[in-house]
Interface confidence: medium
């Protein structure tokens, strides 16, 4: 039975040219996190494997940095980075938990963070 919940940074906005941290946190479960996949729509951005470490897609290597923790830092943001991002937690024995973050990259300097929310 899957009892865990994923808390994410929710709907967030950031300024073009700036950087943003995508963060998810798995709670309410004792399951072991074996791997976290970060995906943008259907594209795999990065992997953090509990044993094998961080691996970043070549397409994003110049603009994506691992961490903090199991999170992901996006740098040199462009308007094209606007969209949905998913953190996929592979756990044992529970299975897979998925969190969703929507990022809006703004041209203006008025970029405010959205509220945190939970996905059961």
């Amino acid at each position: 039975m899957m009892t865990g919940t994923i808390e994410t940074t929710g709907n967030i906005s950031a300024e073009k040219g700036g950087s943003i941290i995508l963060q998810c946190h798995l709670s309410s479960t004792t399951a072991q996190v074996t791997q976290v996949n970060w995906e943008q729509q259907d594209q795999l951005l990065a992997i953090c494997n509990a044993d094998l470490g961080w691996h970043i897609s070549p397409s994003f290597k110049d603009r994506v940095a691992p961490g903090p923790g199991l999170g992901l830092t996006l740098q040199s943001l462009t308007v094209n980075d606007t969209g949905e991002y998913f953190c996929i937690y592979h756990t044992y024995p529970d299975g897979t938990y998925t969190g969703r973050i929507f990022l809006e990259v703004l041209e203006s300097s008025v970029a405010e963070h959205g509220a945190r929310f939970q996905i059961p």
Epitope: Q35, N37, L44, N49, D51, L52, H55, I88, T96
Partner: nanobody, 121 residues
Framework: EVQLVESGGGLVQPGGSLRLSCAAS????????MGWFRQAPGKEREFVAA?????????NYADSVKGRFTISADNSKNTAYLQMNSLKPEDTAVYYC?????????????WGQGTLVTVSS
């Protein structure tokens, strides 16, 4: 599921070198993160090194082998390698090759059967 077969183990003197190979079949290395683990007698299996062809050959190493071991992969031969230099008696262990599936929605390892490395004079 990918099948992995290790080779290259053996007896070597302290300070010597060995090169382990891990031949994969049933899948392409570029679809996996390849890792080497080892298990010494009476101890738990531990991470040694990893490489991902998918991420442009990103490599990670355990602190205990940094600067001595080098992991590499030849996608055309579907084989991963572990070059081990400056071997120490404490490197004695069974070395296992592992493939971690990382495509969206997948998880877990496929394991080889292991190859024994003994470092002794």
């Amino acid at each position: 599921e990918v099948q992995l077969v290790e080779s290259g183990g053996g007896l070597v003197q302290p300070g010597g070198s060995l090169r382990l190979s891990c031949a994969a079949s049933g899948g392409t290395l570029s679809s996996y993160i390849m890792g080497w683990f080892r298990q010494a007698p009476g101890k738990e299996r531990e991470f040694v090194a990893a490489i991902s062809g998918w991420s442009g050959g990103t490599t990670n190493y355990a602190d205990s082998v940094k600067g001595r071991f080098t992991i590499s992969a030849d996608n055309s031969k579907n084989t991963a390698y572990l070059q081990m230099n400056s071997l120490k008696p404490e490197d004695t262990a069974v070395y296992y090759c592992a493939a971690a599936r990382f495509a969206p929605g997948s998880r877990g390892y496929d394991w080889g059967q292991g190859t024994l490395v003994t470092v002794s004079s």
